[in-house]
């Protein structure tokens, strides 16, 4: 069973001092929501017993294996069902505590009732404050039964449940009609899945005979021991004030376990700690009684004395639960109550015995759960004991269960059962996960779900280049940390696999499935510098750069140009996908903007060092385009252009720029300035005869404006080849008059 205890502090004078603590003795309990152990959960369960809403309860985690619930403001906050959930995977277990109001009309004589399948359960509600109304019994919040208030027997209302079955388990309550539900008596009924002394799927297996009030678990046959007892059969008492499956926990406070209720996994339920009894666990056991709830009687023989925590304390020469066994009878010594081995291992098990006459090697035997008897291979004889060593054949899963060491001499016999847990080494169900990669290293998360048993003691990461036949490299890591694989080759695929191990010999599991992880390209190391830039318009910028000359091939796929607009907090990135490029035209920029510009080389996804930045100011946007541009040939070398001024000008025009290009020509266009902005006409001279030309123009204020429409016109006749166009401008009206 899972080592999980829910403690309720029952000193109820002040609800604000009330607390519930859930303690787990499981390895790695409550560490967090990863594959290595989900957290402990402690909460009030309002599904059956609903209480008025109040301030939220406070949950505090004390280390990894303990969680405490506080913040109860009034007594009604305490009434109801609380649960703690702990353990991982199939071992996830819920422990339940039911709290009754001490001022309720009806109080349970006993809150937890654990019964066997087919038994008759009797729930007894004691009258604390009488009401002359019907008594309503509910099961898990639903109506179950009614008793007339005259049906009380000795001040108690009894609910008899004959032939109970596991589905009958749950929370029962007895309430007077017309009374507050918080005044109910609440009970917890636990019905084991088997008849008395049996366990297993078909209830075919025999329980180990749990001592001291321990309860045999119907699924795994283990004894769930009362608080204060340990061992496979709960045969051993803990020191006063200690609890947990290995007596590893200590009751808080100076008065030990007084005033505490202990709730353990089903089918145990709840009880006071060893040595205490009463509804608030504050009364010490009466003489002759001991154990949880003081339910056990000592009945010590041969001068033994009764200790309320541990039972009979025997004088020398005697042992046994009631000091009924003479020390002449052989006795198994210090046998561990539970042993754990890994599957397919061949462990050695030791069993020591003493007695008079002295046990010899042949008088000690080991019996497996299937009845096979092993004889010891060697024995170590010491003055006070004989230790027999048994070599166990290769373990299989069926070897899990109760083994027995038995000693027989002419003085009598003794046997000790102990639990052997055969654990399956863990095998990863998934491949490790790549977190980050660089050119020479991979950062890997080895945390994966696994089949088999935990806890995980070590994680081995095996890796080698893909399609390689070389030996695997191995790195051993802490289970909870990410792993960095170093000194790898750039741009190389690696096959990576996880191998998990659990404690003990043979705890290494099979390797998990492989995954391919690829290192990044080498980082580009060259730093470019900006050669220059020039503005080609209010929103266009041509940039050029250089790289230092180095021997060998260029490590890079292209360049990244970055323009940072500090005013708007915006970055523009331009990808130049050729590593040979040394110039780029940036378009669609914001006119009148101050940009910070730099360039860097990239390779795969990695960026090299950025060039020193340059600061560029784009001119503001210019005026709208001139309107109604018209071209008219005047001669074999002259064409007159006329236009109208742009509309909605933001300021006075400083000049016009005319673009002249031979139609169908491949050469660059010629730009001609018209420096008298008031004019609306100009004559372009020095053109070639009988040649078709394209014209467009734009105005300039602080920056150049939009281009007008393009017009076409041909020069006249077959004149001489001109030297090239020039212009002469006039007001349009004047030109037309000539």
């Amino acid at each position: 069973a899972v080592d999980l205890t829910l403690l309720a502090n029952l000193r109820l004078t002040d609800p604000q001092r009330f607390f519930l603590t859930c303690v787990s003795g499981e390895a790695g309990a409550g560490r967090g929501s990863d594959a290595w152990g989900p957290p402990l959960l402690l909460e009030k369960d309002d599904r059956i017993v609903r209480t008025p809403p109040g301030p939220p309860l406070r949950l505090a985690r004390n280390g990894s294996h303990q969680v405490t619930l506080r913040g109860f403001s009034k007594p009604s906050d305490l009434v109801g069902v609380f649960s703690c959930v702990g353990g991982a995977g199939a071992r996830r277990t819920r422990v339940i505590y039911v709290h009754n109001s001490p001022g309720a009309h009806l109080l349970p004589d006993k809150v937890t009732h654990t019964v066997n399948k087919g038994d008759t359960a009797v729930l007894s509600a004691r009258v604390h404050k009488e009401k002359q109304t019907d008594v309503i019994w509910k099961s898990n919040g639903s109506y179950f039964y009614t008793l007339d208030w005259h049906e009380a027997q000795d001040g108690r209302f009894l609910l008899q449940l004959p032939n109970v079955q596991p589905p009958s388990s749950g929370i029962y309550s007895a309430t007077y009609l017309e009374a507050s539900p918080l005044g109910s008596a609440f009970f917890r009924l636990i019905v084991r899945g088997c008849g008395a002394g049996r366990w297993g799927p078909g209830c075919t297996k025999e329980c180990p005979g749990c001592l001291h009030g321990g309860v045999c678990h119907d699924h795994d046959g283990e004894c769930v021991c009362p608080p204060g007892f340990t061992g496979t059969r709960c045969e051993q008492a803990c020191r006063e004030g200690r609890f947990g499956q290995s007596c590893q926990e200590q009751c808080p406070g100076i008065s030990g376990c007084r005033g505490l209720t202990f709730c353990l996994p089903d089918p145990y339920g709840c009880s006071c700690g060893s040595g205490w009894r009463g509804s608030q666990c504050q009364e010490a056991c009466a003489p002759g009684h001991f154990g949880a709830d003081c339910r056990l009687q000592c009945q010590c023989q041969n001068g033994g004395t009764c200790d309320r925590f541990s039972g009979c304390v025997c004088p020398s020469g005697w042992h046994g639960v009631h000091c009924e066994k003479s020390d002449r009878i052989p006795q198994i010594l210090n046998m561990a109550s539970e042993l754990e081995f890994n599957l397919e291992t061949m462990p050695r098990i030791n069993c020591a015995a003493a007695g008079n006459p002295f046990p010899v090697r042949g008088s000690i035997e080991l019996r497996k759960p299937d009845g096979t008897v092993l004889l010891s291979t060697k024995a170590i004889v010491e003055p006070e004991k004989t230790t027999a060593e048994f070599e166990v054949p290769r373990l299989v899963l069926a070897d899990s269960g109760f083994w027995e060491c038995r000693v027989s001499t002419s003085g009598g016999q003794d046997s000790r059962r102990f639990k052997v847990n055969v654990k399956v080494p863990p095998v990863p169900l998934a491949a490790p996960r790549l977190l980050t990669k660089q050119s020479r290293q991979l950062v890997v998360s080895p945390l994966v779900s696994f089949s088999g048993d935990g806890p995980i003691s070590t994680v081995r990461l095996h890796y080698r280049p893909q399609d390689s036949t070389m030996d695997w490299s191995t790195i051993v890591v802490d289970p909870s940390e990410n792993v960095t694989l170093m000194n790898l080759r750039p741009k190389t695929g690696y096959s990576v696999r996880v191998q998990l191990s659990r404690p003990g010999e043979g705890g290494e599991g099979a390797w998990g499935p492989p995954t391919l992880m690829t290192t990044d390209c080498p980082e580009p190391l060259l730093q470019p510098w900006l050669e220059g830039w020039h503005v080609e318009g209010t929103d266009r910028l041509r940039v050029s750069w250089s790289l230092p000359l180095v021997p060998g091939p260029l490590v890079g796929d292209g360049f990244l140009l970055r323009l940072w607009d500090g005013t708007r907090g915006q970055e523009r990135r331009e990808n130049v996908s050729s590593p040979q490029a040394r110039t780029a035209l940036l378009t669609g920029l914001t006119p009148g903007t101050h940009y910070q510009l730099d360039v860097q080389l990239y390779h795969c996804t990695l960026l090299g060092p950025a060039s020193p930045p340059a600061h560029v100011l784009l001119p503001p946007s210019g005026p709208p385009a001139p309107r109604h541009l018209h071209a008219q040939a005047l001669s074999d070398s002259e064409i007159q252009l006329t236009w109208k001024h742009p509309e909605a000008l933001p300021g006075p025009i400083s000049k016009y720029v005319v673009e002249v290009q031979v139609a169908g020509g491949a050469g660059d266009p010629l730009w001609i300035d018209v420096d008298r902005p008031e004019e609306t006409s100009t004559i372009i001279r020095g053109l070639n005869a009988s040649t078709r030309y394209l014209f467009r123009m734009r105005a300039s204020i602080q920056g150049l404006g939009d281009w007008s429409n393009t017009v076409e016109e041909s020069t006249l006749g077959n004149g001489l080849q001109a030297e090239g166009p020039v212009q002469e401008s006039r007001a349009a009206e004047e030109g037309l008059d000539q």
């Epitope: 109506y143 009614t146 008793l147 007339d148």
Partner: antibody, heavy 121, light 111 residues
């Protein structure tokens, strides 16, 4: 279907006896208190008797105490009313009904059709 | 045993609202418990549950029927009176004697 069905009524002479039955179906009969209620011709409803689920506890109206006995057989899902020393004033339609509880409340949610008992010479 | 007193008859026109009262005689019935229920009985038929716990309506019962309680008196109000509401109405209260006390009954007539 959840229902109650009374039977056993009829004509009987004063001082005579009659046994009424009420067969329950469609619900867990054994967990509910069961009640007999009667209604004399042209009169109101009168509570007669209650029997609790165990069958061991019963209550009666003063007008029938000592003459009527309520009982139940949970294995047969049947409620009974044994009526002895009948009087003319016992003439009525006898209904069986169940008492239910919801969030602690008590009321009659299910009624039979009734069976007529006539006491006359 | 306790007695629950109701008016012998109440009448109203269609669409009107009417109220039937139910007054207990002791703290052992209406005044002492919140468990007053109301039943409707048409001639020749078995009673039918209308209201329980003073104010709650079972599913299937029209929301024209509503219940209330003040001190030792419980009330049933029928709003928007309809012809099919013409019937006898009984209140009932839990009593610790184990008895279930019924009211004297009220005949409702729709004019």
């Amino acid at each position: 279907e959840v229902q109650l069905l009374e039977s056993g009524g009829g004509l009987v002479q004063p001082g005579g006896s009659l046994r009424l039955s009420c067969a329950a179906s469609g619900f867990t009969f054994s967990i509910y208190p069961m009640i007999w209620v009667r209604q004399a011709p042209g009169k109101g409803l009168e509570w007669v008797s209650v029997i609790y689920p165990s069958g061991g506890h019963t209550r009666y109206a003063d007008s029938v105490k000592g003459r009527f006995t309520i009982s139940r057989d949970n294995s047969k899902n049947t409620l009974y009313l044994q009526m002895n020393s009948l009087r003319a004033e016992d003439t009525a339609v006898y209904y069986c009904t169940r008492r239910v509880y919801s969030s602690g409340s008590a009321y009659f949610d299910l009624w039979g059709r009734g069976t007529l008992v006539t006491v006359s010479s | 045993q306790s007695v629950l007193t109701q008016p012998a008859s109440v009448s109203g026109s269609p669409g009107q609202s009417i109220t039937i009262s139910c007054t207990g005689t002791s703290s052992d019935d209406v005044g002492g418990y919140n468990y007053v229920s109301w039943y409707q009985q048409h001639p020749g038929k078995a009673p039918k549950l209308l209201i329980y716990d003073v104010i709650n309506r079972p599913s299937g019962v029209s929301n024209r029927f509503s219940g209330s309680k003040s001190g030792n008196t419980a009330s049933l109000t029928i709003s928007g009176l309809q012809a099919e509401d013409e019937a006898d109405y009984y209140c009932s209260s839990y009593a610790s004697s184990g008895a279930r006390v019924f009211g004297t009954g009220t005949k409702v007539t729709v004019l």
